[in-house]
Amino acid sequence: NKILVKQSPMLVAYDNAVNLSCKYSYNLFSREFRASLHKGLDSAVEVCVVYGNYSQQLQVYSKTGFNCDGKLGNESVTFYLQNLYVNQTDIYFCKIEVMYPPPYLDNEKSNGTIIHVKGKHLCPSPLFPGPSKP
C-alpha cells in the first residue's frame, strides 16, 4: 500500500522564495515520519528534510546552499524555500516515509513541481538631466 502525493505542477519564485505544498493521502497526526524534497529529474539531490514524531517538535534540515523551513498539516507538509538562485530552477519531488506505527509506508513517485526561479531585475533608475545649457 502506497501513499499518494499531490504537488502543484509549477511554481514561480518571483522574490526568490516559494511555498511548495506536498499533499498526502495519509494523515500524519501522531505518526513518526520523514518528509523530504528532492531536486532533479532523477531525484538525485535531497535538499530538505522534515522529521516528525508524536513526542518531539518538528525538525527541519536544509542542505548547504538551500534555505528551507517546513510546516506540518494533518495530511500535508509545506516546504518554504527562501533565497533561491536562478540556477536552482528545476523539478522538485516530494517524498514521504512513515516509520511508526507499523507498517512502514512510503509514497508512489509524484509528478513533481517545476520551480522556476525568476532573477531579480533591477529597475533602471530614472534619468535626471543636468542643468540645461543655453
Epitope: E32, S36, T64, M99, Y100, D106
Partner: nanobody, 124 residues
Framework: EVQLVESGGGEVQPGGSLRLSCAAS????????MGWFRQAPGKEREFVAA????????DYAESVKGRFTISRDNAKNTVYLQMNSLRAEDTAIYYC?????????????????WGQGTLVTVKP
C-alpha cells in the same frame, strides 16, 4: 529512537593508525547520515567526517583530508572511520552522531543522536 555504540579507540604512536566503528540500531528510514565529531579537552566538539546512507555523499574536515576515510556497511548499519598518519593534535574523544538529514552534514546541530564517545590518544 536510535542507539549508537562506538568502539575502536585506544592509544597509538604518531604516524600510527586506528579504525573506529559505530553501530546504529533502532528505526531507520531509507536515507540518513552518520558522522564523526571529536572533542579535545577544553575545546568545542568539532566535525571530523560524515557519510550518508546511499554512500553518494561524504565530507571531511580540512584537517583530516587525505588521512582519514569514512565508510559504511549498510547491512550492519555501521560506519567506520579509518584514521591514518595520526598526530598528537588528533587526540580527543571521538563521538559518532546520527542525523535524519540525507546528506553528509558537518553541522553539529543537525545531529539528533550521539554515542557515548571513544577516546583516541596519540603520544610517543
Amino acid at each position: 529512537e536510535v542507539q549508537l555504540v562506538e568502539s575502536g579507540g585506544g592509544e597509538v604512536q604518531p604516524g600510527g593508525s586506528l579504525r573506529l566503528s559505530c553501530a546504529a540500531s533502532g528505526r531507520m528510514f531509507s536515507n540518513y547520515a552518520m558522522g564523526w565529531f571529536r572533542q579535545a579537552p577544553g575545546k568545542e566538539r568539532e566535525f571530523v567526517a560524515a557519510i550518508n546512507y546511499r554512500r553518494d555523499d561524504a565530507d571531511y574536515a580540512e584537517s583530516v583530508k587525505g588521512r582519514f576515510t569514512i565508510s559504511r556497511d549498510n547491512a550492519k548499519n555501521t560506519v567506520y572511520l579509518q584514521m591514518n598518519s595520526l598526530r598528537a593534535e588528533d587526540t580527543a574523544i571521538y563521538y559518532c552522531g546520527f542525523t535524519y538529514a540525507g546528506w553528509a552534514s558537518s553541522r553539529r546541530d543537525d545531529y539528533n543522536y550521539w554515542g557515548q564517545g571513544t577516546l583516541v590518544t596519540v603520544k610517543p
